[in-house]
């Protein structure tokens, strides 16, 4: 688990207690099992504009 | 370039313990895994564990839990693995690899291979 | 655990021919990202194993183009399209989609 007292990880990372630090989600296309994409599972994208009415 | 320079060869007698090493060089340790692998004369490869050197964390196969311990020293960008009560079943080449954990896939690197012996 | 399974030995093959490696694994490679988590290694004689292979079908680095694969979430195949004396050795399929990391038992390429 995070550290108490440390910054939340900013939006599309997630954070590593493997690693120790917060991660890009991107890198979970290397190596999915790694713990912090757990996270990046559970926290959608961004949300994106409908290229359509 | 990224280099994994493994220990030389060992000679143990069975019951004992041995202590084989990785260093590597070439780019930051502590942001990629190090693992080890077995691989019998003729035979295959058999994942043993790996480390993550920042934080020593360790992932083992449930095979050799208890037969392996993975540490490794930031300090010298080393890893070791050691082997405990050793039979002639552990007579094998170990090799050390980089795994990486990024986006950006540039492959895995493997040491040289360490060869282990064991006979009385 | 995931059972990756290959046959021991390929077909002998001529130089400069083409030649064909398979490999099964015991459940689907493919994530919910669209990716297949297979990798191919060579061990050349008294070397280390070298990736070939990443995510099914991308080349490594420094790896000729001689080399391809492809295949569904469980089935796999390693083409070699000019088979070179440079290319023999045992050919190790392996997944990366969870651990343990397991490999298959390798498949020896020979030449007629």
């Known amino acids: 688990e995070q550290a108490p007292g440390t910054a939340p990880c900013s939006r599309g990372s997630s954070w590593s207690a493997d690693l120790d630090k917060c991660m890009d989600c991107a890198s979970c296309r290397a190596r999915p099992h790694s713990d912090f994409c757990l996270g990046c599972a559970a926290a959608p994208p961004a949300p994106f504009r409908l290229l359509w009415p | 370039q990224v280099q994994l320079q493994q220990s030389g060869p060992e000679l143990v007698k069975p019951g004992a313990s041995v202590k084989m090493s990785c260093k590597a060089s070439?780019?930051?340790?502590?942001?990629?895994?190090i693992a080890w692998v077995k691989q019998r004369t003729g035979q295959g490869l058999e994942w043993i564990g790996e480390?993550?050197?920042?934080?020593?964390?360790?992932y083992y196969s449930e095979k050799f839990r208890g037969k392996a311990t993975l540490t490794a020293d930031k300090s010298s960008n080393t890893a070791y693995m050691q082997l405990s009560s050793l039979t002639s079943v552990d007579s094998a080449v170990y090799f050390c690899?980089?795994?990486?954990?990024?986006?950006?896939?540039?492959?895995?690197?493997w040491g040289q291979g360490t060869t282990l012996t064991v006979s009385s | 655990d995931i059972v990756m399974t290959q046959a021991a030995f390929s077909n002998p093959v001529t130089l400069g021919t083409s030649a064909s490696i398979s490999c099964r694994s015991s459940?689907?490679?493919?994530?919910?990202?669209?990716?297949?988590?297979l990798y191919w290694y060579l061990q050349k004689p008294g070397q280390s194993p070298q990736l070939l292979i990443y995510?099914?079908?991308n080349l490594a680095s420094g790896v000729p183009d001689r080399f391809s694969s492809s295949g569904s979430g469980t089935d796999f195949t390693l083409r070699i399209s000019r088979v070179e004396a440079e290319d023999v050795g045992v050919y190790y399929c392996?997944?990366?989609?969870?651990?343990?990391?397991?490999f298959g038992g390798g498949t020896k390429l020979e030449l007629k």
């Open positions: 690899a980089r795994r990486t954990i990024y986006y950006d896939y540039d492959g895995d690197y």
């Open positions: 995510q099914m079908s």
């Open positions: 392996a997944h990366n989609l969870e651990l343990p990391w397991t």
């Open positions: 459940k689907s490679l493919l994530h919910s990202s669209g990716i297949t988590y």
């Open positions: 480390i993550y050197p920042g934080t020593g964390r360790t």
């Open positions: 070439g780019y930051t340790f502590t942001d990629f895994i």
